[in-house]
Interface confidence: low
């Protein structure tokens, strides 16, 4: 029942152009090129996209025309390899062009940079943005796609089209408003925050597929879709999982036209079959395509069917457990995961996957034993500690969050993680710990039944950021170990890390703790980041410092910044008071 089996097309590029329409075709090709060649100027990408689009139109007119039968990878790869400055801009990435498909595309994929050396996006004045929007709306929106795509090379392309649509709507509405800034800025903030979250979530999906394989992704999808659609039958969930896996494999592999096309087909299928999938889809299915796909992806869990029988009957008490397992291992484990997940919307997906892994390990051992039933009879008892561990961790951390508030909770995590993995770069520790700390405001407000899926699945996304950033420049064996051994045990692995006793403290450098008057003009967020950067450096210098000592130094530091920002001669204050603060802190910490 796969929705994606299509007749063979003479010209793949013509087929996708016709399916997607010119506007979406051009947008997706721009995203694809910007995600591959992240340093190229905007104008160069627009030129390449226009050339590809003109070529696609000739193929639509005549599918038998020259080169129209070539694969999209061949067409796009050839186009990327015409960039004159490839060698000087991208170095060894230029070697990809000497390869044949499919190796050439794999080579481009391997050179995607999760942390490209690009300037921070600075938001111009509202009037400047509105003028640019009115002067050339098309260029303005293309530039948005380009800037996001090059900074987020794994951003889910069809979802980026949805963001661009909202971006356009915000400018269309707000540039006519009486108070443009009051209308526009909150919308742009919301899009920025949602965009970062969307990028990080998709990055985990791609890491799951690329580092742990299709089976790992499918297991994740079975668990999540079974929670979301508990009334759907196993066969229906399996079909959705197969189709969803194809969509994400394509997007993560740079096949953005196929991905967007297949995602639209999947949304169409879900809406045509909502009666057998979920009662919550009605509103989503009334929306236009981009909104519809987004809405389905975010739809709330359907109500669990009443009177679901005990799981034990089929998976523990039955005499046929080993027979069923032996006949089709992955199908049987998939059914176990489906049945467990649909009964437990209160569990995180990663916990459900740990339970399934424990069940699998037990069956592997017990089905070879003299008395299999006796051997696996108590398997559900092994789940108890696995369930309690995240429950307790979330309870403790939400209590700490409520006690401290977000900023101080982030600081506690900064200290905790710097002590665990002090070799990791300071910007990465700050970024990751700040995001870990956001779990408090995101999830602790929820009732018990929603806390774990919110918190632990969010932490999986954030820890994946650490893993992909660390992979670029590996500095810690402990990080590598936690990131590569097991996808579902990453969070418990990091939680279990103690202070790294092998770490040799960093030499003290007064320059690291020298601050200037420019800190006074920073936004509250930027000021926090400055202070948190200093805190990480402090822990790297003095990893054995107590909480009390660190708190005292940070409180003194906050007071120093506040005092100097109120001073008439700010720069002199920062210079003189800063020296005193550093000396006092050194004395207090024994540096």
């Amino acid at each position: 029942r796969g929705v994606f089996r299509r007749d063979a097309h003479k010209s793949e590029v013509a087929h996708r152009f016709k399916d997607l329409g010119e506007e979406n075709f051009k947008a997706l090709v721009l995203i694809a090129f910007a995600q591959y060649l992240q340093q190229c100027p905007f104008e160069d990408h627009v030129k390449l996209v226009n050339e590809v689009t003109e070529f696609a139109k000739t193929c639509v007119a005549d599918e038998s025309a020259e080169n129209c039968d070539k694969s999209l990878h061949t067409l796009f790869g050839d186009k990327l390899c015409t960039v004159a400055t490839l060698r000087e801009t991208y170095g060894e990435m230029a070697d990809c062009c000497a390869k044949q498909e499919p190796e050439r595309n794999e080579c481009f994929l391997q050179h995607k940079d999760d942390n490209p050396n690009l300037p921070r996006l600075v938001r111009p004045e509202v009037d400047v943005m509105c003028t640019a929007f009115h002067d050339n709306e098309e260029t303005f929106l293309k530039k948005y796609l380009y800037e996001i795509a090059r900074r987020h090379p794994y951003f889910y392309a069809p979802e980026l089209l949805f963001f661009a649509k909202r971006y356009k709507a915000a400018f269309t509405e707000c540039c006519q408003a009486a108070d443009k800034a009051a209308c526009l800025l909150p919308k742009l903030d919301e899009l920025r925050d949602e965009g970062k979250a969307s990028s990080a979530k998709q990055r985990l999906k791609c890491a799951s597929l690329q580092k742990f394989g299709e089976r790992a992704f499918k297991a994740w999808a079975v668990a999540r879709l079974s929670q979301r659609f508990p009334k759907a039958e196993f066969a229906e969930v399996s079909k959705l999982v197969t189709d969803l896996t194809k969509v994400h494999t394509e997007c993560c592999h740079g096949d953005l036209l196929e991905c967007a096309d297949d995602r639209a087909d999947l949304a169409k299928y879900i809406c045509e079959n909502q009666d057998s999938i979920s009662s919550k889809l009605k509103e989503c299915c009334e929306k236009p395509l981009l909104e519809k796909s987004h809405c389905i992806a975010e739809v709330e869990n359907d109500e669990m069917p009443a009177d679901l029988p005990s799981l034990a009957a089929d998976f523990v008490e039955s005499k046929d457990v080993c027979k069923n397992y032996a006949e089709a291992k992955d199908v049987f484990l998939g059914m176990f995961l489906y049945e467990y997940a649909r009964r437990h919307p209160d569990y995180s997906v990663v916990l459900l996957l740990r339970l399934a892994k424990t069940y699998e390990t037990t069956l592997e051992k017990c089905c070879a034993a003299a008395d299999p039933h006796e051997c696996y009879a108590k398997v559900f008892d092994e789940f108890k500690p696995l369930v309690e561990e995240p429950q307790n961790l979330i309870k403790q951390n939400c209590e700490l969050f409520e006690q401290l508030g977000e900023y101080k909770f982030q600081n506690a995590l900064l200290v905790r993680y710097t002590k665990k993995v002090p070799q990791v770069s300071t910007p990465t520790l700050v970024e990751v710990s700040r995001n870990l700390g956001k779990v408090g405001s995101k999830c602790c407000k929820h009732p018990e039944a929603k806390r774990m899926p919110c918190a632990e699945d969010y932490l999986s996304v954030v820890l994946n950021q650490l893993c992909v950033l660390h992979e670029k420049t590996p500095v810690s064996d402990r990080v590598t170990k936690c990131c590569t051994e097991s996808l579902v045990n990453r969070r418990p692995c990091f939680s279990a890390l103690e202070v790294d006793e092998t770490y040799v403290p960093k030499e003290f450098n007064a320059e690291t703790f020298t601050f200037h008057a420019d800190i006074c003009t920073l936004s509250e967020k930027e000021r926090q980041i400055k202070k948190q950067t200093a805190l990480v450096e402090l822990v790297k210098h003095k990893p054995k410092a107590t909480k009390e000592q660190l708190k005292a130094v940070m409180d003194d530091f906050a007071a120093f910044v506040e005092k100097c920002c109120k001073a008439d001669d700010k720069e002199t204050c920062f210079a003189e008071e800063g020296k005193k603060l550093v000396a006092a802190s050194q004395a207090a910490l024994g540096l």
């Epitope: 409520e402 977000e406 602790c444």
Partner: nanobody, 122 residues
Framework: DVQLVESGGGLVQPGQSLRLSCAAT????????MAWFRQFPGKEREFVAA??????GYVADSMRGRFTISRDTKDTMILRLSSLKREDTAIYYC?????????????????WGHGTQVTVSE
């Protein structure tokens, strides 16, 4: 929007107790921290006590031991005043934040009740 309604104020003698209650109505209120402030004539509002969404209570140092804060339900907050003194005479205001954590500054609270008068007198 959110409405806060205080009740339980009144006239008591020194040394006696009172139970002030604050009920939140309007949109779903489960994520909010709530607090009590009091105001003496011609003075700024003074922080009394606060409680987080998760039920973590905090009472101002000068009142700790005599006043206790709790949540009856997620949208009802109770302040118990015992061993009342004449200087506790004031208007007591209920306040709520848009976030789940507590704060002691009045400016951090988005929603306010109209207040309930507590008078301690012979």
């Amino acid at each position: 929007d959110v409405q806060l309604v205080e009740s339980g104020g009144g006239l008591v003698q020194p040394g006696q107790s009172l139970r002030l209650s604050c009920a939140a109505t309007g949109r779903s209120f489960t994520t909010n921290a709530m607090a009590w402030f009091r105001q003496f004539p011609g003075k700024e509002r003074e922080f009394v006590a606060a409680i987080s969404w998760g039920g973590l209570g905090y009472v101002a140092d000068s009142m700790r031991g005599r006043f206790t804060i709790s949540r009856d339900t997620k949208d009802t907050m109770i302040l118990r005043l015992s061993s009342l003194k004449r200087e506790d005479t004031a208007i007591y205001y209920c306040a709520a934040r848009k976030t789940s954590t507590t704060a002691t500054e009045a400016t951090m609270y988005a929603y306010w009740g109209h207040g309930t008068q507590v008078t301690v007198s012979e």
